[in-house]
Each structure stands twice: as structure tokens, then as C-alpha cells.
């Protein structure tokens, strides 16, 4: 008997979708109604839970009790400031556990709690069933997408979702990544290409830019904003349509809840028309006090409402251009993703910003997520058909990581937008003589000082043998795998100690809103952040080159190669610049720069002298590019150069 | 002895550039730090900057940054001052002074008139 | 940056008597390691290049006469002129160095 499939699901915030990899191909599965998405719907009654189609249908008559959105709940706080937001938008009730949201509804007759990920394992459970009546056998192992910012709490959230649905997950990827593999498997042997995938959706919208060779998938860049998608465009219209009923009845729809929903479920179907058509008419019957409501609206009307929303998605285009250092016209294709993306506006807009450029709409946008999930569930199967067979995917680290250095300064060993797998290894030393230990703090983030980033963990590599500052050498590694693990490790390379922190999804990381919030605090930020970093540079760098300067005088082994006078010059100098150093650590870059030159001005025609034909450093040897490096609580490491 | 002989006085219109020389003797070049201070008519010292003389690396006051560059010859002992896009008021007389723990030998002094 | 407000701008002085004038830092000069004040005196006479006169708050530059001496710390300095000759007449600059270099004002001293 043939092995059983892996399917992928994209798990949508307002629709999901299925597909599995067999007999050398992908296929999209359609459910019950025979619809290739299924809403992300659950619904509670007083004699059963409905999920999807029939879940979404019936939220008209029954929304206190139809829960939707789940995704936006998923793996955050109750106090999270999104949640907080989203919950005045939302029919159902959610109720705060232990900083924990819970949906509250009424089943059965009884009041029940279910946490986010309770919901979205209804939605799983759902998309599992599909897959299994297809395929006529059970299916357990699935791969399982999430929006490219999903922070590591959410990730796992999901993971768990698809623990509670009975699934085995074999991997959560990011929707963007997902959709070029659906895209790259058409295209394998056509060279390197540039491709920007657009994924606007129900509720998130995703700005990839990925390198396609040959099969290989790199993801350069990734941006976006988890709160855009068609259901805000929804609200636009139905806002637009809550104003007309106003005008013409002289009566506020707004605070009846059933008359919205209504009123939104027309106003989606309209949106939809008006991708094909130029106007939608709308024809609710006794929409509010017995009125009916019969209405018409343009798509120039349409675009007009959300005329801000469009233009706001070429922001996510232009910065995920600038973090891939490619200019517009770098990019070989267009991808369009997600149901929205078929707004004619939409489309217009991307397609102006790069000068008429074709789009590629080859991928129903509203599949190709699930299809990718599909193509890597296969991977991970071991599936040796020859579509797939050579096909690697390479996702990115959103934020750089790296380790607190002296002076408090960010020093990243894995960069942001770094493909993973990827492990890179940098040789720190000691800030202090006789430093027993060090202390390796590890952060995540874009900014300059590690203060103003995100701690992630920290540990301590103790037993350092006595030695002079900058003698030690420790070798720190960080090691990221496919799951986005971190794994770092500190090697003292004289006694061969180790010692390592794993950093895993359930340590709390930051959100997608932090995450953004941090990149652009860190484009904000990035001169002043860029005059901080040269300035504990130049001060580590004079710091570095005094100590350097004082020992290698002080050296036994010069003892008769230099004079007591220069020795007592660089001596004297060196206490001067020391000295100084303490009394101001806070100076300009400019003053540390000085303060260097002249201490190099007095050391290296002495130092030079005593090197000149012994094949050891010339002048300068020593090095005036010190440190890079930092304060904190514990022992300092320093970066070596 | 210790000397700093510095280039002729130079007249220049608005624009153009001027570069005043400063020859060393006397001492090793390269072990002293050389600075170029300003003198306005009838104004006080102003300091320019330095530079390192054995890395060759410049250091400019606030006021210099940009139109100013300092830079040596060791070969013969010679730092450089070169202004460029000048303007009327930068005539002053230019001076170069060895550094030891302080500016310990001056130049003469080179004066720039800058007049169109 | 550090500021040196020299005082007075000028004074005259009878051949003979003591010429006292101050330099005022807007940040201390001392380095606690060495010690030391980082400023220096300078002495120029019209239409001649400036001389160094005293260095590290009160040390003379050899060849300089006794009868000058510097005193203060911190950011208060002196120089005195103890018995005003002739050949002393001249503006006189007081210059930090303790983070890049700054010249004071300069005072014009003159025979009554």
C-alpha cells in the first residue's frame, strides 16, 4: 500500500485551504459544497458546532456565537494592544484568563470558554476531514502556514492548534515562502529570477521577495502588515453603506448587530462582483425595522473608500525592496496572492509602480499557499518525485541576533533577513585582566544598542584561566535551524569549555506588531543609531589600543629593546588617555578618534622601532580598530577583529 | 635646530584653492603630531586641526570639515594644508605647529588674501 | 566642546609690576590619573608667530623666564607675569588640551 499523504493547510485568517502533493502533482481539495477555501468559521448553537461554510452561513442569524478571527487571537495576550482593538470589531465575546483571551459563547445552552487555538483546531480539524474524505484514508501529517511576522508564541499557538486536531506538524512556514514554492515549481530551470510575491488576503497582507534557481527557493525579504486584507475593505463599504442608510431612512444601523452582519455578508458579495464587474447592486430585505434595503454601488465608488488602503500596500513593496537591496526593476516577476489581489485597483496600482510590468496571476491567489504547504509536506515526506525532488526552500530570520558586546553595543552574528538554516560562528575575548568569566547575553533587533532591543537569553561561560584582557579566546556560535531554533554556543578555545543557551518557541518573542515596530523604530532610529555605534567604537578602539599599548611596553620580553624614556612616554600617555577614558565615557566620536590619533602618534614610531626586521606587526600593529563592545550586568565580552 | 618653514603668501580669488606647505627639520618627522591653527586680521587663534603625521590620519575642528585637507609628504618632511571653494573669510594667516605636550615650534605663518 | 573665556580682553600694566590674567573652562581640565590640568599658555607678539610659555597648567617651556608662572585647576587658571618687562608685551592665549584643542579669547597686555 502506498504511504499516506502529507497535505498542507493554509490556515487563513477568514479562509482556509487544502492541498496534498500525489502522483506528481499538487491538488487543491474541495469540501462538502464544493468550494476549494473554507471559511475559518466555528459556530455554536443550542444543538450543534458548525464549522466553515456552514458556520459562516448562519452568521447573520447567530453571531454572538460565531467565532472568526481566530488567527488574531492566536498566541497573544489578552492585553496585547491588538487584541484589545479587535475586540470592539467583534460580535463574540472575548473574556480575559490568566492574560489569556477566551472566546466566549453560548452552546448547548451552557456558557463555554475555548481558547484561540481551540478554534483554529475546529478549523484544522475540518480541513483534515476534507483531505480524508478525498483521499479515502486518514491523514495525520501536515505542514501548516502562518503569516511571514508570526512571532515564535504564535507559531507555537498554531503548532498546538494542530497537536489538539490530531495532525503531526511537520513544519509551520510562512505563507509568502509557501506561495513560491507554488510558483517556483513551474519555473525550475529558467535561471536565477527575482520574484516579489504580494499576498493580500482576508486579513493579512505579505510582501515576499525571493530568489528562484533551478528549484531553490531564497526568501531576500519579507514585509507587511498582518491587519489589511479584504475584510478591511469590507468595513469601508459596509461603513459607506451604514452612512446611506442614514441619509435615506434617517436611521443608524451601527449598534444592531445582526443588521451589520447582514449588511457585511452583501457587501463582501459585492466587493467580489466588482472585480468583474465596474457595479454591484446590494438587495437586503428588512435589513433594519422592517426596511429594505436595495442599493448600488460603482467600483469607482468602491475605489474611492479604499483608495488609502490600496495605495498603503505599496509601503510593504518599497521597503521590502530596500531590505533586499534591489531596485524595482531587479524584480523578474510579479506574484499575486490571496483573494484580494484580484481588485482590479489593486493590481492597477502594483502593476504602475513597476512601470506596467506584467503580473503573474498563473496561481488561483486564493491556493497557492496551501499549494507550497502541500509541495514542502511532500518534501518533508521524503517524496522522490522529480518536481520536487531538487526543490529546497530557504527561509529568512526576521530580525538580526547577535550578543551584547562592550559598552552595551549590538554585536549580530546573523543579520536580518538571513536565509536559515544558517549558523556563523565570531571569535569574542575578555574586557577585563584576569576575567574569570564571560557573560553571553543574546538579543534580537535592529538597533544599535542592546538596550533598545529584544533579550532573548542569556548564560555564563565561567573558568576562563587568568590572562590578560584580550588574551581569551571564545568562540560563540550561532546556530539557527530550518524550525528557527537558535542555539547558541560560547567555547573557551584554550580549555575547551563550552557552555549553551537553546533559545525554542515557547520563550516568549516578540509580535509581529514589535517586530514591525522595532524595524521601523530602526529605520527611524538608524542615523542616530549610527552615530551611537561609531561612537563606542571609536571609544572601544582608543580603550582597546591603550591597554594594547601598556602591555606590550610593560612586555618582559622588551626589556633592553626599549628605552626607559619611551617606554615611560607611551607609559605616561597611556595613563593620560586611560584616565581620561573613565572620566568620560560619554564623550564624542570625534574626541575618542583625537585621543587615539594622538596616543598613536606617540606609540607607533616607538613600537614600529622595536618590530622593524622581526617579522612581527609594523606599524600600527597592534591595532587601533579596537573592540566593538559593551556593559551589563556581569562579566564583558569584546569583539576581536 | 628645530624649524618650520612655511610657503609664501598667496592671493586668491573667491573659488579657488590654495594648498600653504610647512617643511620640517631638525627632528623625526613622523614622531610628532603636526596642527594648523588660523589667524583672522586682527582676530585670535582659531584651531584648525592636526594631523597624525607616522598614520597619516587627519583630525578637523567643526568649523573645518569639508573644505579643509591636511595631509604629509614624509619623504621631506612636509604637512600640507589645502582650503578649497575659498571665500573672503578665509583670509587669515595660516600657521603649523608641531605637537609634542603642547604646540612647542610654529611656523611663520603663510597669509592667504582672498580678494576678487 | 570645551569654551575658554579669557578675562580681561586687555590690561595695562607698569614696567616692573605684576600682570595677572585668567582663563575660565567650561569643563574641568584635570585628569584624576595623571594629575595633570591640560592647558597651556601662549604668548605672540605682533606680527610674529605664538610661543609656548607654559604647558600642564604651570609647567615652563625651557628657555621661558622664571618670572612667568601658571597656577590654577579644574576649570580656573592663572598666568602671571610676576615683574612686566618690555619684551613682554603681547596677547597671550590660553589653550586646552584635554579633549581636542581649544584657544581662548587672547588678552592684550600692554605698559602703562
Known amino acids: 500500500m502506498a504511504k499516506a499523504a502529507a497535505i498542507g493547510i493554509d490556515l487563513g485568517t477568514t479562509y482556509s485551504c487544502v492541498g496534498v502533493f500525489q502522483h506528481g502533482k499538487v491538488e487543491i481539495i474541495a469540501n462538502d459544497q464544493g468550494n476549494r477555501t473554507t471559511p475559518s468559521y466555528v459556530a455554536f448553537t443550542d444543538t450543534e458546532r458548525l464549522i466553515g461554510d456552514a458556520a459562516k452561513n448562519q452568521v447573520a442569524l447567530n453571531p454572538q456565537n460565531t467565532v472568526f478571527d481566530a488567527k488574531r487571537l492566536i498566541g497573544r495576550k489578552f492585553g496585547d494592544p491588538v487584541v484589545q482593538s479587535d475586540m470592539k470589531h467583534w460580535p463574540f465575546q472575548v473574556i480575559n484568563d490568566g492574560d489569556k483571551p477566551k472566546v466566549q459563547v453560548s452552546y448547548k445552552g451552557e456558557t463555554k470558554a475555548f481558547y484561540p487555538e481551540e478554534i483554529s483546531s475546529m478549523v484544522l480539524t475540518k480541513m483534515k476531514e476534507i483531505a480524508e474524505a478525498y483521499l479515502g484514508y486518514p491523514v495525520t501529517n501536515a505542514v501548516i502556514t502562518v503569516p511571514a511576522y508570526f512571532n515564535d508564541s504564535q507559531r507555537q499557538a498554531t503548532k498546538d492548534a494542530g497537536v489538539i486536531a490530531g495532525l503531526n506538524v511537520l513544519r509551520i512556514i510562512n505563507e509568502p515562502t509557501a506561495a513560491a514554492i507554488a510558483y517556483g515549481l513551474d519555473r525550475t530551470g529558467k535561471g536565477e529570477r527575482n520574484v516579489l510575491i504580494f499576498d493580500l488576503g482576508g486579513g493579512t497582507f505579505d510582501v515576499s521577495i525571493l530568489t528562484i534557481d533551478d528549484g531553490i527557493f531564497e526568501v531576500k525579504a519579507t514585509a507587511g502588515d498582518t491587519h489589511l486584507g479584504g475584510e478591511d475593505f469590507d468595513n469601508r463599504l459596509v461603513n459607506h453603506f451604514v452612512e446611506e442608510f442614514k441619509r435615506k431612512h434617517k436611521k443608524d444601523i451601527s449598534q444592531n448587530k445582526r443588521a451589520v452582519r447582514r449588511l457585511r455578508t452583501a457587501c463582501e458579495r459585492a466587493k467580489r462582483t466588482l472585480s468583474s464587474s465596474t457595479q454591484a447592486s446590494l438587495e437586503i430585505d428588512s435589513l433594519f425595522e422592517g426596511i429594505d434595503f436595495y442599493t448600488s454601488i460603482t467600483r469607482a465608488r468602491f475605489e474611492e473608500l479604499c483608495s488609502d488602503l490600496f495605495r498603503s500596500t505599496l509601503e510593504p513593496v518599497e521597503k521590502a525592496l530596500r531590505d533586499a537591496k534591489l531596485d524595482k526593476a531587479q524584480i523578474h516577476d510579479l506574484v499575486l496572492v490571496g483573494g484580494s489581489t484580484r481588485i482590479p485597483k489593486v493590481q492597477k496600482l502594483l502593476q504602475d509602480f513597476f512601470n506596467g510590468r506584467d503580473l503573474n496571476k498563473s496561481i488561483n491567489p486564493d491556493e497557492a499557499v496551501a499549494y507550497g504547504a502541500a509541495v514542502q509536506a511532500a518534501i518533508l515526506m521524503g517524496d522522490k518525485s522529480e518536481n520536487v525532488q531538487d526543490l529546497l526552500l530557504l527561509d529568512v530570520a526576521p530580525l538580526s541576533l547577535g550578543l551584547e558586546t562592550a559598552g552595551g553595543v549590538m554585536t549580530a552574528l546573523i543579520k536580518r533577513n538571513s536565509t536559515i538554516p544558517t549558523k556563523q560562528t565570531q571569535i569574542f575575548t575578555t574586557y577585563s585582566d584576569n576575567q574569570p568569566g564571560v557573560l553571553i547575553q543574546v538579543y534580537e533587533g535592529e538597533r544599535a544598542m542592546t538596550k533598545d532591543n529584544n533579550l532573548l537569553g542569556r548564560f555564563e561561560l565561567s573558568g576562563i584561566p587568568p590572562a590578560p584582557r584580550g588574551v581569551p579566546q571564545i568562540e560563540v556560535t550561532f546556530d539557527i535551524d530550518a524550525n528557527g531554533i537558535l542555539n547558541v554556543t560560547a567555547t573557551d578555545k584554550s580549555t575547551g569549555k563550552a557552555n549553551k543557551i537553546t533559545i525554542t518557541n515557547d520563550k516568549g518573542r516578540l509580535s509581529k506588531e514589535e517586530i514591525e515596530r522595532m524595524v521601523q523604530e530602526a529605520e527611524k532610529y538608524k542615523a542616530e543609531d549610527e552615530v551611537q555605534r561609531e561612537r563606542v567604537s571609536a571609544k572601544n578602539a582608543l580603550e582597546s589600543y591603550a591597554f594594547n599599548m601598556k602591555s606590550a611596553v610593560e612586555d618582559e620580553g622588551l626589556k633592553g629593546k626599549i628605552s626607559e624614556a619611551d617606554k615611560k612616554k607611551v607609559l605616561d600617555k597611556c595613563q593620560e588617555v586611560i584616565s581620561w577614558l573613565d572620566a568620560n565615557t560619554l564623550a564624542e566620536k570625534d574626541e575618542f578618534e583625537h585621543k587615539r590619533k594622538e596616543l598613536e602618534q606617540v606609540c607607533n614610531p616607538i613600537i614600529s622601532g622595536l618590530y622593524q626586521g622581526a617579522g612581527g606587526p609594523g606599524p600600527g600593529g597592534f591595532g587601533a580598530q579596537g573592540p566593538k563592545g559593551g556593559s551589563g550586568s556581569g562579566p564583558t565580552i569584546e569583539e576581536v577583529d | 635646530q628645530i624649524q618650520l618653514v612655511q610657503s609664501g603668501a598667496e592671493v586668491k580669488k573667491p573659488g579657488a584653492s590654495v594648498k600653504v606647505s610647512c617643511k620640517a627639520s631638525?627632528?623625526?618627522?613622523?614622531?610628532?603630531?603636526m596642527n594648523w591653527v588660523r589667524q583672522a586680521p586682527g582676530q585670535g587663534l582659531e584651531w584648525m586641526g592636526w594631523?597624525?603625521?607616522?598614520?597619516?590620519?587627519?583630525t578637523y575642528a567643526d568649523d573645518f570639515k569639508g573644505r579643509f585637507t591636511f595631509t604629509t609628504d614624509t619623504s621631506t618632511s612636509t604637512a600640507y594644508m589645502e582650503v578649497r571653494s575659498l571665500r573672503s573669510d578665509d583670509t587669515a594667516v595660516y600657521f603649523c605647529?608641531?605637537?609634542?605636550?603642547?604646540?612647542?615650534?610654529w611656523g611663520q605663518g603663510t597669509l592667504v588674501t582672498v580678494s576678487s | 566642546e570645551i569654551v575658554l573665556t579669557q578675562s580681561p580682553d586687555s590690561l595695562a600694566v607698569s614696567l616692573g609690576e605684576r600682570a595677572t590674567i585668567n582663563c575660565k573652562s567650561s569643563?574641568?581640565?584635570?585628569?584624576?590619573?595623571?594629575?595633570?590640568?591640560?592647558l597651556a599658555w601662549y604668548q605672540q607678539k605682533a606680527g610674529q608667530s605664538p610661543k609656548l610659555i607654559i604647558y600642564?597648567?604651570?609647567t615652563r617651556e625651557s628657555g621661558v623666564p622664571d618670572r612667568f608662572s601658571g597656577s590654577g585647576s579644574g576649570t580656573d587658571f592663572t598666568l602671571t607675569i610676576d615683574s612686566l618687562q618690555a619684551e613682554d608685551v603681547a596677547v597671550y592665549y590660553c589653550?586646552?588640551?584635554?579633549?581636542?584643542?581649544?584657544f581662548g579669547g587672547g588678552t592684550k597686555v600692554e605698559i602703562k
Open positions: 569643563q574641568s581640565l584635570l585628569n584624576s590619573g595623571t594629575r595633570k590640568n591640560y
Open positions: 605647529a608641531r605637537y609634542d605636550h603642547a604646540m612647542d615650534y
Open positions: 594631523i597624525n603625521t607616522y598614520t597619516g590620519e587627519p
Open positions: 631638525g627632528y623625526t618627522f613622523t614622531n610628532y603630531g
Open positions: 589653550k586646552q588640551s584635554y579633549t581636542l584643542y581649544t
Open positions: 600642564w597648567t604651570s
